[in-house]
């Protein structure tokens, strides 16, 4: 039996990582031991799973690594890898500093909102995750049809505002659709704006009838696809 030890300490010499906002950061703590140790990560001394982070994190245990894409100022802090087995434990601290960029248009997380399929009567949540260093406002829009047309004479779509708020109010990034009906099907857009400009991404909601036999075979109430 052997306590954990670093297998490539030379790869861990860079303790301070100062990176521009928007870049990807990778921390590695390659280790070994007997029995094979486990690795977990802390941020500023607290267990870190990335659930509150836009874009989440990637933990690759076989590579002893933590990856964060599109870092933002709130990602700043001390990241600790804690490697342990039954015999002992070792830890190492990385310091992350995120260098703020110039104010830019809002950046929306790729793939959100996601195309969604739901059954009549079910509830749907459409998510929109926004990064903006200037305070953004968000609007949820539904694309609608007027006189049989989705577009006006100017070539722009007809839209209906479903929800408007500033990002710092609660749940602004989620559009809740309760008890959906066939009329709720269609294209939904998350529009984020700040003092520099606007950005938006759209998704389609497909609503299936309750008695659809192909649907009942596929268990979940709401299905999310990219």
């Amino acid at each position: 039996q052997q306590a954990p030890y670093w297998t490539h300490p030379q790869r861990m010499e860079k303790k301070l990582h100062a990176v521009p906002a928007g870049n990807t950061v990778k921390f590695r703590c390659p280790a070994a031991g007997n029995p094979t140790p486990t690795i977990r990560w802390l941020k500023d001394g607290q267990a870190f799973h990335g659930e509150n982070r836009i874009g989440g994190i990637r933990l690759r245990h076989q590579h002893w690594s933590l990856v964060m894409e599109s870092v933002v100022p709130s990602d700043r802090g001390t990241y600790t890898c804690l490697v342990e087995n039954a015999v002992g434990s070792i830890r190492y601290n990385y310091l992350l500093d995120v260098l703020e960029r110039s104010p830019h248009r809002p950046i929306l997380q790729a793939g959100l909102p996601a195309n969604t399929t739901a059954v009549v009567g079910s509830d749907v949540e459409l998510l929109c995750k926004v990064y903006s260093d200037a305070q953004p406002h968000i609007q949820w829009l539904k694309h609608i049809v007027i006189n049989g047309s989705s577009f006006g004479a100017d070539g722009f779509p007809y839209v209906q505002v479903l929800k408007t708020a500033d990002i710092n109010s609660s749940e602004v990034e989620v559009l809740y659709l309760r008890n959906v009906s066939a009329e709720d099907a269609g294209e939904y857009t998350c529009l984020a704006g700040n003092s520099i400009g606007l950005s938006y991404q759209s998704a389609w909601l497909t609503v299936l009838p309750e008695e659809d036999p192909t649907w009942t075979a596929a268990a979940p109430e709401a299905r999310y696809t990219d």
Epitope: S102, P103, L141, P157, S195, I196, G197
Partner: antibody, heavy 124, light 112 residues
Framework: EVQLLESGGGVVQPGRSLRLSCAAS????????MHWVRQAPGKGLEWVAV????????YYADSVKGRFTISRDNSKNTLSLQMNSLRVEDTAIYYC?????????????????WGQGTMVTVSS | DIVMTQTPLSLSVTPGQPASISCKSS???????????VYWYVQKSGQPPQLLIY???NRFSGVPDRFSGSGSRTDFTLKISRVEAEDVGVYYC?????????FGGGTKVEIK
């Protein structure tokens, strides 16, 4: 008709102050970010500052930071630029420009409407 | 800051002939939403700039279809398919992706 009308320009000595105003009409002013852009005589265009639709966010070019202050009064549909510690190199035509609005961008999301400009001359 | 470099400095064109203006940015203007935030303006003598093209290739309302914008990421082009006398002026490209917003140095278009 959508219009922006600047005023307040004039001749001023270096180190002095001047306040520019921009009166907006024909659109919902309180729903749009607003910018100032300037152009020195015979030169190109230089962005100066922006203010968000509600005035909560303001950003400045490095060349004016700490000297110029952008503000707005949504109840009066006016945009202002307070210019302190003026320098000879601040001599330019100052344009008021409409920025991004709230809601679906039916066309460009800003920088589509410019005022006629007001001339500021800083000279001893 | 993003630097916008425009060429040529000036252009003398025969009426009815095409004209092309190039603009290069020091960083990509392709945003995560898939749009490329380069704008083109013309400034005629004694007037403020007028928007011609937005988001790389969209013609602003009222702009004749002889004007077109193209390019990708860092290299952009404004083309006038057949120059007319009224097209005389200084043409500017602008990046509208982050502050400070920056403009190209301008291209003066004259008629031969």
């Amino acid at each position: 008709e959508v219009q922006l009308l600047e005023s307040g320009g004039g001749v001023v000595q270096p180190g002095r102050s001047l306040r520019l105003s921009c009166a907006a009409s024909g659109f919902t002013f309180s729903s749009y970010a607003m910018h100032w852009v300037r152009q020195a005589p015979g030169k190109g265009l230089e962005w100066v500052a922006v203010i968000s639709y509600d005035g909560s966010n303001k950003y400045y070019a490095d060349s004016v930071k700490g000297r110029f202050t952008i503000s707005r009064d949504n109840s009066k549909n006016t945009l202002s630029l307070q210019m302190n510690s003026l320098r000879v190199e601040d001599t330019a035509i100052y344009y008021c420009v409409r920025g991004a609005g709230l809601g679906w961008p039916y066309g460009p999301d800003g920088f589509d409407i410019w005022g006629q400009g007001t001339m500021v001359t800083v000279s001893s | 800051d993003i630097v916008m470099t425009q060429t040529p400095l000036s252009l003398s064109v025969t009426p009815g002939q095409p004209a092309s203006i190039s603009c290069k940015s020091s960083r990509s203007l392709l945003h995560s939403d898939g749009k490329t935030y380069v704008y083109w303006y013309v400034q005629k003598s004694g007037q403020p700039p007028q928007l011609l093209i937005y988001e790389l290739s969209n013609r602003f309302s009222g702009v004749p279809d002889r004007f077109s914008g193209s390019g990708s990421r860092t290299d952009f082009t404004l083309k006038i398919s057949r120059v007319e006398a009224e097209d005389v002026g200084v043409y500017y490209c602008m990046q509208y992706i982050e502050a400070p917003l920056t403009f190209g140095g301008g291209t003066k278009v004259e008629i031969k």
